[in-house]
């Protein structure tokens, strides 16, 4: 049909800015590039009906359904959702196409369904159908990868039983320490499930899908390294596979490795050995100890011995349930305005935790670093010297942990004032919490030295804004001070700040701020 307009249906995904929530202005958010929903004419339907591709949206995501109409003349429109009519305001873009948009903020179950858009142009009437559903991520899982020996081969298979199917990668590093950070040139990634090169210094397997990323490191004892001051400890849950690699390098092949559990040699079938010559013609041997499914009696000291190296041990602890061990008592800190400072939490946990730092309802990424003593540490330095309450939250499959921190920034008070017909109030957020004085300015006291003590009401910690205490002082108006200028001053060990208020009849009040150091 020649009269039919050229229609384009697009989906715009938005990145939510907290400030935009609840506003329904045309484009309250940062937007991603539009995705074409390919509006196609629906066959065998009465009237002209276009159908857009089905739209799946994450819970709380914000989207715009948009229709671009290339038709001559003006258009009018109406949205219908669940039998309710919704306002529709078309506008025209630079190419003079009619643009009709439906913004859905913070997608919820109640906003899922069929959105019908009725458009009337000078030439014809037609309907556009959008079907919006919530993506079912409840069935999604991301499980920590585990290792299995490949049958009849000296190789490890990495398995992560996750939905959707993850990308499985080996992350290999042949250098020591800091240079084994994820994005360092010393780190090599291989997207494959089977690894044959098992001689590297650091071997991890990672699985990634929509839910994020989980990694498992191949626990290694290196007989050529100086042993840690504290015995390395490996935690596992009942039923999980145990893998420990013992590695040793020697000038020639004349040495052997053995594994013992509590002074008893491991049974055949619970270990395998590999060896290779390195570039400088030294011999590298590795001996794996493995148990396909651990039980409580697999707990104990696993010792790797060599005929040419001092032996080293690791303590393997089998637990029924995961845990997070850390002190959860809240901590308060007081720092100067430019002092460098980081919050830190030291913990021992198994399985590895997922964590967040939260301040003022905003979450920040959480990094954790393993310490030599089996503990891990998470630090948060990105507080930008904002006082308030900071929350560290950690969880794994079996346990949860929350720790509160309060940050106080030492600074002189800053005063804000407001007044009504009956009283004047001053507020300050300085720290330490300030004390207040009120002074009356008059002919007798042009420098406002006449102190007011009657009718003053001080409230420490009037409101707690995300842990930030605010102190206030209120002066009830009496006939004696009506029509006068009064000055409220907040002072602490770092200085004083004042604000002058004209106490007259109700109306706008001029405020004059004095800063006295």
């Amino acid at each position: 049909n020649q009269d039919l307009p050229v229609i384009k249906c697009v989906l715009i995904n938005h990145k939510n800015n907290d400030s935009s929530v609840g506003k329904s202005s045309s484009y309250p958010m940062v937007s991603e590039s539009p995705e074409d929903l390919g509006c196609a004419l629906r066959p065998q339907s009465s009237g002209t009906v276009y159908e857009a591709a089905a739209v799946e949206v994450d819970v709380s995501a914000s989207i715009t359904l948009q229709v671009l109409v290339d038709a001559p003349g003006n258009i009018s429109c109406l949205w219908v959702f669940k039998h309710s009519s919704l306002n529709c305001q078309p506008h025209f873009d630079l190419q003079n196409r009619g643009v009709v948009s439906m913004v859905i903020l913070k997608m919820t179950e109640t906003q899922a369904g069929e959105y019908l858009l009725f458009i009337q142009s000078e030439a014809t009437n037609y309907t556009i159908l959008f079907t919006v559903s919530i993506r079912n991520t409840l069935l999604y899982t991301l499980r920590r990868p585990y290792f299995r020996k490949m049958e009849n081969q000296d190789a490890l298979v990495c398995i992560s039983e996750s939905v959707p199917e993850p990308i499985v990668e080996w992350v290999l590093c042949d250098s020591q320490g800091e240079s084994c950070k994820e994005e360092s040139p010393a780190v090599v990634k291989k997207e494959e499930k089977v690894l044959h090169e098992l001689f590297g210094t650091d071997i991890r397997c990672c699985a990634r899908n929509e839910l994020g990323r989980e990694c498992t490191r191949l626990f290694t004892i290196d007989l050529n390294q100086t042993p840690q001051t504290t015995l390395p400890q490996l935690f596992l849950k009942v039923g999980e596979p145990l893998w420990i690699r013992c590695k040793a390098v020697h000038v020639n092949h004349g040495f052997g490795l053995t594994w013992e559990l509590e002074n008893k040699a491991l049974e055949e079938g619970n270990y395998f050995e590999m060896s290779t010559y390195s570039t400088n013609r030294t011999m590298i041997r590795i001996l794996f100890a493995f148990v396909s499914s651990v039980a409580r009696n697999d707990t104990g000291y696993y010792t790797c011995s060599s005929s040419k190296h001092p032996s080293q041990s690791a303590l393997v602890t089998i637990v029924e349930k995961g845990f997070i061990n850390a002190t959860n008592s809240s901590e308060d800190y007081e720092i100067d305005q430019y002092e460098e400072f980081c919050f830190s939490v030291r913990f021992k946990a198994y399985p590895q935790i997922r964590c967040t730092w939260t301040f003022s309802r905003k979450s920040f990424p959480c990094e954790q670093k393993g310490l030599d003593n089996g503990y891990s540490i998470s630090k948060f330095c990105n507080h930008k010297h904002q006082p308030g309450e900071y929350i560290f939250h950690a969880e794994n499959d079996d346990a949860q942990f929350t720790k509160m921190f309060t940050l106080n920034i030492r600074r002189k008070p800053q005063v804000l004032a407001e007044a009504s017909a009956s009283q004047a109030s001053c507020f300050s957020d300085g720290y330490p919490l300030p004390s207040w004085t009120w002074k009356k300015c008059s002919d007798k006291s042009p420098n406002c030295t006449e102190e007011i003590t009657e009718g003053v009401w001080n409230r420490k910690a009037n409101r707690k804004v995300f842990g930030q205490w605010v102190s206030s002082s209120t002066l009830n108006m009496s006939e004696a001070i009506k029509g006068f200028l009064v000055k409220c001053c907040a002072y602490n060990s770092l200085g004083t700040s004042c604000e002058t208020i004209l106490l007259n009849s109700p109306g706008p009040f001029p405020f004059i701020q004095d800063n006295i150091s």
């Epitope: 939905v163 959707p164 199917e165 990308i167 997207e191 494959e192 499930k193 089977v194 990634r208 929509e210």
Partner: antibody
Framework: EIQLQQSGPELVKPGASVKVSCKAS????????MYWVKQSHGKSLEWIGY????????SNNQKFKDKATLTVDKSSSTAFMHLNSLTSEDSAVYYC????????WGQGTTLTVSS | DTVLTQSPATLSVTPGDSVSLSCRAS??????LHWYQQKSHESPRLLIK???QSISGIPSRFSGSGSGTDFTLRINSVETEDFGMYFC?????????FGAGTKLELK
């Protein structure tokens, strides 16, 4: 030598469906995800999804969720992509690739949807 | 979705020139970015994986750098066989996405 051999070009009518195959050789089929990509004429590439041949687990681009179904036949080391309810928008070259980093690619299967 | 913006859209060069192709991600993607070359009527070919890792069989004149949001593919001393389309692809967040491509053409 590692090779991914795709089935030949297809000319189908709107509303029909088609099954594109990708036969792998020269490596262990179950050790790598099989990745499917669409390239419309003169355009960039679009990820459709991938399948783990070991367990049949998949990850799909939501855009192709109702369009493409990925399967494998381990015995013949072959991956399949079934495309349904075809429209002219589905006319494109479809590629299979080994792994999401795509170190080996099939030669592509050209699909033309036309009445 | 993570949008990959490639620039320039077209690059006209003379054999022997050295060039840099840019790929910018709309959000941080660590180093999970890969570069492909595609010649007319051919399948894409992997050049660089994970930002900088070289691929066996790919000439050493191709190198990659960057992590986070900004990535570069460098071709030292372009040869006539290098002309074609270059795509970047991220495998950090779902859906996996490709850039629109940079066309490397003969000046």
């Amino acid at each position: 030598e590692i090779q991914l051999q795709q089935s030949g070009p297809e000319l189908v009518k709107p509303g029909a469906s088609v099954k594109v195959s990708c036969k792998a050789s020269g490596y262990s089929f179950i050790d790598y995800n099989m990745y499917w990509v669409k390239q419309s004429h003169g355009k960039s590439l679009e990820w459709i999804g991938y399948i783990n041949p070991y367990n049949g687990g998949t990850s799909n681009n939501q855009k192709f969720k109702d369009k493409a179904t990925l399967t494998v036949d381990k015995s013949s080391s072959t991956a399949f992509m079934h495309l349904n309810s075809l429209t002219s928008e589905d006319s494109a070259v479809y590629y299979c690739a080994r792994g999401t980093t795509g170190d080996y690619w099939g030669q592509g299967t050209t699909l033309t949807v036309s009445s | 979705d993570t949008v990959l913006t490639q620039s320039p859209a077209t690059l006209s060069v003379t054999p022997g020139d050295s060039v840099s192709l840019s790929c910018r991600a709309s959000q941080s993607i660590s180093n999970n970015l890969h570069w492909y070359q595609q010649k007319s009527h051919e399948s894409p070919r992997l050049l660089i994986k994970y930002g900088f890792q070289s691929i066996s069989g790919i000439p050493s004149r191709f190198s990659g750098s960057g992590s986070g949001t900004d990535f570069t593919l460098r071709i030292n001393s372009v040869e006539t066989e290098d002309f074609g389309m270059y795509f970047c692809q991220q495998t950090n967040s779902w859906p996996l996405t490709f850039g629109a491509g940079t066309k490397l053409e003969l000046k």
